[in-house]
Every structure is written in structure tokens, then in C-alpha cells.
């Protein structure tokens, strides 16, 4: 009996530019002889329904139809037909099919590959055209994929040390698509510094599918207006 097992759940998520290994494990009742077996990997794009050959391995020969694509002969010996794709790109997301032939048997499995890009976040103070005692803080998130992103603002005071979400005076702009397919967005927080306590810590919180934990950038309101704290300068740009 010949069986193929792919990533549990049927989906693999990988960071943009990563060297991804798309899993495909072979289960066979006898020891594998790699000189008498065949492995073919196919890819079907998210945008069109045509299947394309990515890599094939037959006995003493292997061929990559996508530069750098490889199945390890040394791992194949122990039943691992996983496909390594170095420098994965956004457009390479889609369905991957692993087809294994141990004559006369054939088995296959499919997996969806999602490619994500994590946002970089930075805080800026915009002083241009602002009224007296007014500050505009901008939280720029850039280079993320997919487009869906959630940006919120929180504050912590000495009185209330637990973060409180700010809903007023927050404007989040439209997402802008970059040439490489990733996205940028900017969220703005308008503050009236005369009405806020010095020492209040403000945080821009970015949540995205590519992040295990939210990305947090913070600044502390100081007595001297328009001065950004050391916390913001040193800790919060990624």
C-alpha cells in the first residue's frame, strides 16, 4: 500500500522570501528504493486554474522547472518527498500537489500554500499645520500581505495602568499597494497635549495574519510638548 500525507489541516503558511519546505511524506509497506520511484510536484495558481510542473525526480535524474526547487534524495530514502522552494514570492501562493509513483502504485496529496509578509511599523510626529497644543502621531505600517490589517491605539496612564483603547480622533487611511504586491497603511492619532497627563504612554497596536503577537510601537507624553520619549526612539521601530 502506498500513501501520501501532506501538512495537517491542508494549509501551510510561509513568510515572503523564506526558504519554504512544503511537506509530503510517503508511507509504503516496504523500504523505498529511490532509483525506481518517481516524484512530481505541481503548482496551481490562485488566479488561474492551470496546473504547472514545478519539480520532478525519476531514478537517477531530477529536474527543477522553478529555479532552486529541490526534493532531497537523502530525505526521500526515509520517505520524505518534501519540496524546498528558496526565496518564496507572493505570486507563488496556491495549491501544490505531490505525486508519488512506486510502480505500479501511485499516490498524491495537495496542500494550499499561503505566503504572508509581516508589517514593519514606525511612529512619526507630524507637526505641520497643527494648532497650538495639538499633536498628530502617525503609525506607518508597511510591506504587509495580505491586505487585511487592524491598527488600534491604546493609552496607559499612571491612574489606569491597564491599556485603554482610544476610539476618538483616530483616522486610518486607505491601504496602498506597493510595486512588489505588499501593502502600506498609515493610522493617525490626534492629541490635545494640554488635556493629557505627562507620563501617559500611547501605543499603536498592529494586528496582522503574519504576526503571532501584535506589533506595538509606543511613545510617552512628556511635559515638553512635541518631544518624543526615549522609549519610542529606541524600542519601538521594527
Amino acid at each position: 500500500d502506498l500513501k501520501v500525507e501532506m501538512m495537517a489541516g491542508g494549509t501551510q503558511i510561509t513568510p515572503l522570501n523564506d526558504n519554504v519546505t512544503i511537506f509530503c511524506n510517503i508511507f509504503y509497506s516496504q523500504p523505498l528504493n529511490i532509483t525506481s520511484m518517481g516524484i512530481t510536484w505541481f503548482w496551481k495558481s490562485l488566479t488561474f486554474d492551470k496546473e504547472v510542473k514545478v519539480f520532478e525526480f525519476f531514478g537517477d535524474h531530477q529536474e527543477a522547472f522553478r529555479p532552486g526547487a529541490i526534493v532531497s534524495p537523502w530525505r526521500l530514502k526515509s520517505g520524505d518527498a518534501s519540496l524546498r522552494l528558496p526565496g518564496i514570492q507572493l505570486e507563488e501562493a496556491g495549491e501544490y500537489r505531490c505525486e508519488v509513483v512506486v510502480t505500479p502504485l501511485k499516490a498524491q496529496g495537495t496542500v494550499q500554500l499561503e505566503v504572508v509578509a509581516s508589517p514593519a511599523s514606525r511612529l512619526l510626529l507630524d507637526q505641520v499645520g497643527m494648532k497650538e497644543n495639538e499633536d498628530k502621531y502617525m503609525c506607518e505600517s508597511s510591506g504587509f500581505y495580505p491586505e487585511a490589517i487592524n491598527i488600534t491605539w491604546e493609552k496607559q496612564t499612571q491612574k489606569f495602568p491597564h491599556p485603554i483603547e482610544i476610539s476618538e480622533d483616530v483616522i486610518t487611511g486607505p491601504t496602498i499597494k506597493n510595486m512588489d504586491g505588499t501593502f502600506n497603511v498609515t493610522s493617525c492619532l490626534k492629541l490635545n497635549s494640554s488635556q493629557e497627563d505627562p507620563g501617559t504612554v500611547y501605543q499603536c497596536v498592529v494586528r496582522h495574519a503574519s504576526l503571532h503577537t501584535p506589533l506595538r510601537s509606543n511613545f510617552t507624553l512628556t511635559a515638553a510638548r512635541h518631544s518624543l520619549s526615549e522609549t519610542e526612539k529606541t524600542d519601538n521601530f521594527s
Epitope: 537517477d60 529541490i70 520524505d80
Partner: antibody, heavy 120, light 111 residues
Framework: EVQLVQSGAEVKKPGASVKVSCKAS????????MDWVRQAPGQGLEWIGD????????LYNQKFRGRVTLTVDTSISTAYMELSRLRSDDTAVYYC?????????????WGQGTTVTVSS | DIVLTQSPDSLAVSLGERATINCKAS??????????MNWYQQKPGQPPKLLIY???TLHSGVPDRFSGSGSGTDFTLTISSLQAEDVAVYYC?????????FGQGTKLEIK
């Protein structure tokens, strides 16, 4: 920085078993196989086998088949080599080594070695 | 099993001179256009250190006085200008077939 840190020296009696650990850090554990190689005093190098942390698949040198068991715990990036029914000629330094498997096959980083002495 | 025979067993070379170590395989270690022959250096009390893989590719951080050549069954490790720190035992290893096998080693000393 890639590091492989092996467990300490062992002294065993003939017939006993020994289990050597190899803790990996500084790289993605599942991207490389782990080779095990031994070296008897004053002798050359001898390949015991390797394990693929991706699926737990193992390849053994026939000479050790039935006596050696290679395992991994991916949650702590650690590989293990257990050798049973020890004999005096199993006295050697046992090495784990990270093994590239996609673009060639070679052991590019080695553990410091674990001395196993089998003596009655 | 593929048997690897190194020659010579030991070698004494003057500082600054060329050192050459040969490795002969009992059958070809070539596969799909590549040669699966690696070279390691081992100093007393230390683990082996990778020098050359795929017959001729220098491992990162290895000085370029080390070079490897050959294909099929005959391979050579060359040190173009021997340095004091090159005193060690050198091993060839094939990784084409299991079990992966090593040569018996060549001890390199300073003359």
C-alpha cells in the same frame, strides 16, 4: 550561531544501553538532518546513521541495525542516539553533526563529542 | 559499501609548501552530474571540521589555500601553502550511498 551541545561522558557495563543527547540551536532544526558518527580510540570515523527531524525518518548503517535507535524531540530541538547491548568495542567518542540534505549531503557543524566507555 | 582509500597514510610537508592528499573510491560517487565527496579536517581532541563538499566547493570560513578536485572515483585535497595550524588528520567521505563511508585518514605533519 549554530551550536550542537552533547550530553556528558558515560561509563557503561557490557550488555547495557546508552542514550546520548544533542541539543541544537542557531538554526531551524527541521531544515537539516542529524548525522551520528563515532570514533574509536586512535581510529577513524564511522557513520552510524541519520534522522530527518521533519518526519522522524531514519537511515542506519547495517552494522548497527537492531542495536541503534535515533530519535528527535522537535519541541526542544534535540536529537538522541541510543545504543543497546553494548560491547567493549563500542568504546568511542560519539558525535552528532548537522547534515545538509537539499543542496548536497555533508555534515557542516559537529557536536563536541560524547565519550562512551564500555568496561566490566 | 563504497570503500574509500586515502593515500598516503601520513605526509610531512615543509611550511609554505604544497600538500596533496588523494582519495580513491571503490565505485563512482557521482550522481546526476555532481560528485558526492566531502573532506574533513580533525585536530587532536576536537570534532571533525568540514573543509570541502561536493568534491570542490569550499565551506564558508575555510581558507582558500584549501581546494578539492576530482570526479567519479578519484579525488584530491590540496593545501597550496602549508601553515602550522594545518597539522591534523584529513578524511574524505562519500555521501552518494548508504552507509556513508570515510577514508582511513591521512595524518599531515610539518617537515
Amino acid at each position: 550561531e549554530v551550536q550542537l551541545v552533547q550530553s556528558g561522558a558515560e561509563v557503561k557495563k557490557p550488555g547495557a544501553s546508552v542514550k546520548v543527547s544533542c541539543k541544537a540551536s542557531g538554526y531551524t532544526f527541521t531544515d537539516y538532518n542529524m548525522d551520528w558518527v563515532r570514533q574509536a580510540p586512535g581510529q577513524g570515523l564511522e557513520w552510524i546513521g541519520d534522522i530527518n527531524p521533519n518526519n522522524g525518518g531514519t537511515l542506519y548503517n547495517q552494522k548497527f541495525r537492531g542495536r541503534v535507535t535515533l530519535t528527535v524531540d522537535t519541541s526542544i530541538s534535540t536529537a538522541y542516539m541510543e545504543l543497546s547491548r553494548l560491547r567493549s568495542d563500542d568504546t568511542a567518542v560519539y558525535y552528532c553533526a548537522r547534515s545538509e540534505v537539499f543542496y548536497g549531503n555533508y555534515a557542516d557543524y559537529w557536536g563536541q563529542g560524547t565519550t562512551v566507555t564500555v568496561s566490566s | 559499501d563504497i570503500v574509500l582509500t586515502q593515500s598516503p597514510d601520513s605526509l610531512a610537508v615543509s611550511l609554505g609548501e604544497r600538500a596533496t592528499i588523494n582519495c580513491k573510491a571503490s565505485q563512482s560517487v557521482d550522481y546526476d552530474g555532481d560528485s558526492y565527496m566531502n573532506w574533513y579536517q580533525q585536530k587532536p581532541g576536537q570534532p571533525p571540521k568540514l573543509l570541502i563538499y561536493a568534491a570542490s566547493t569550499l565551506h564558508s570560513g575555510v581558507p582558500d589555500r584549501f581546494s578539492g578536485s576530482g570526479s567519479g572515483t578519484d579525488f584530491t585535497l590540496t593545501i597550496s601553502s602549508l601553515q602550522a595550524e594545518d597539522v591534523a588528520v584529513y578524511y574524505c567521505q562519500q555521501s552518494k550511498e548508504d552507509p556513508r563511508t570515510f577514508g582511513q585518514g591521512t595524518k599531515l605533519e610539518i617537515k
